[in-house]
């Protein structure tokens, strides 16, 4: 049985302020059962960027349809990027439970924000 891998192919992404950033994440298995969530930063101070349960997250859209079955693409797009969005973004698989527990994280994608072209 294949062990779950979380693939964040881009080590870094650079986006001009005001544009959108696409953060790529794919997984290799539907197991373990449980949700994917996106965070900026690591540790206790990390910030939730997107999950299906909370929100709304008005600047975040999913690249794949949220109703797609057996989907393995959990990439997101963040619109209207500002310097405050800079940081490292992690795609994280949680194991279903009470509560859900973190199972595995992608390696992270560092988002840097360039000044808006004048």
């Amino acid at each position: 049985e294949e062990e779950l891998q979380i693939i964040q192919p881009d080590k870094s992404v650079s986006v001009a302020a005001g544009e959108s950033a696409i953060l790529h994440c794919t997984i290799t298995s539907l197991f373990p059962v449980g949700p994917i969530q996106w965070f900026r930063g690591a540790g206790p101070a990390r910030v939730l960027i997107y999950n299906q349960r909370q929100g709304p997250f008005p600047r975040v859209t999913t690249v794949s349809e949220t109703t797609k079955r057996e989907n393995m693409d959990f990439s997101i797009s963040i619109s209207n990027i500002t310097p405050a969005d800079a940081g490292t973004y992690y795609c994280i698989k949680f194991r279903k439970g009470s509560p859900d527990t973190e199972f595995k994280s992608g390696a992270g994608t560092e988002l840097s924000v360039r000044a808006k072209p004048s």
Epitope: Q52, T67, R69, E70, K96
Partner: antibody, heavy 120, light 108 residues
Framework: DVQLLESGGGVVQPGGSLRLSCAAS????????MTWVRQAPGEGLEWVST??????YYADSVKGRFTISRDNSKNTLYLQMNSLRAEDTAVYYC???????????????WGLGTLVTVSS | EIVLTQSPATLSVSPGERATFSCRAS??????LAWYQQRPGQAPRLLIY???IRETGIPERFSGSGSGTEFTLTITSLQSEDFAVYYC??????????FGGGTKVEIK
């Protein structure tokens, strides 16, 4: 075509045990979560248990008495039922889970069911 | 645990007519709701998932709508094979998965 075929049902006394099996074919069994749902005579549907790879989930009404397991080499799902009670009498259906990407699971294929009767 | 309440419990409809029945969730389940049909003596069959998406092979006369806590299944122009029991199921918050108590569609 996806096929799910349950077996192992029958009549058992209260406190007894049964093991149900569900033989699956027509899909990559090891890649999908699987579920047992039951239906008491003349009643509605009640979720019993779900298994992913090794992760298992149970309804409170069966927790500690029922054990779900799978053998991916045999494409077979199991439900070991111990300490059976009269209220466990039902048709037990095996179902294949389908996962919606950012969400949860529903059941896109069902077996025909096997009847378990708990009676003295 | 999220409780799903289906109404009416029984719906009497003439063949060719429209049938509409509802499923109400005790809390917000977004669009994470499925509908199943169960004919007498048969296993349930998936009709709709994500509140509105028809499963492959399900006729267009079946349609789902709603989100949050209020959902509706509509069958336009009932055929003889549509007389059955219909169940909703939420998969937003589990375990446990929960089902509604069912709506029986019978011939008027």
């Amino acid at each position: 075509d996806v096929q799910l075929l349950e077996s192992g049902g029958g009549v058992v006394q209260p406190g007894g045990s049964l093991r149900l099996s569900c033989a699956a074919s027509g899909f990559s069994f090891s890649n999908f979560a699987m579920t047992w749902v039951r239906q008491a005579p003349g009643e509605g549907l009640e979720w019993v248990s779900t298994i992913g790879s090794g992760d298992t989930y149970y309804a409170d009404s069966v927790k500690g008495r029922f054990t779900i397991s799978r053998d991916n080499s045999k494409n077979t799902l199991y439900l070991q039922m111990n300490s059976l009670r009269a209220e466990d009498t039902a048709v037990y259906y095996c179902a294949k889970d389908s996962t919606v990407s950012w969400s949860g699971d529903f059941f896109d294929y069902w077996g025909l069911g096997t009847l378990v009767t708990v009676s003295s | 645990e999220i409780v799903l309440t289906q109404s009416p419990a029984t719906l009497s409809v003439s063949p060719g007519e429209r049938a509409t029945f509802s499923c109400r969730a005790s809390q917000n389940v977004k669009n994470d709701l499925a509908w199943y049909q169960q004919r007498p003596g048969q296993a349930p069959r998936l009709l709709i998932y994500a509140a509105r998406i028809r499963e492959t092979g399900i006729p267009e006369r079946f349609s789902g709508s709603g989100s949050g806590t209020e959902f509706t299944l509509t069958i336009t122009s009932l055929q003889s094979e549509d007389f059955a029991v219909y169940y909703c199921q939420q998969y937003y918050d589990w375990p446990p998965f929960t089902f509604g108590g069912g709506t029986k569609v019978e011939i008027k």
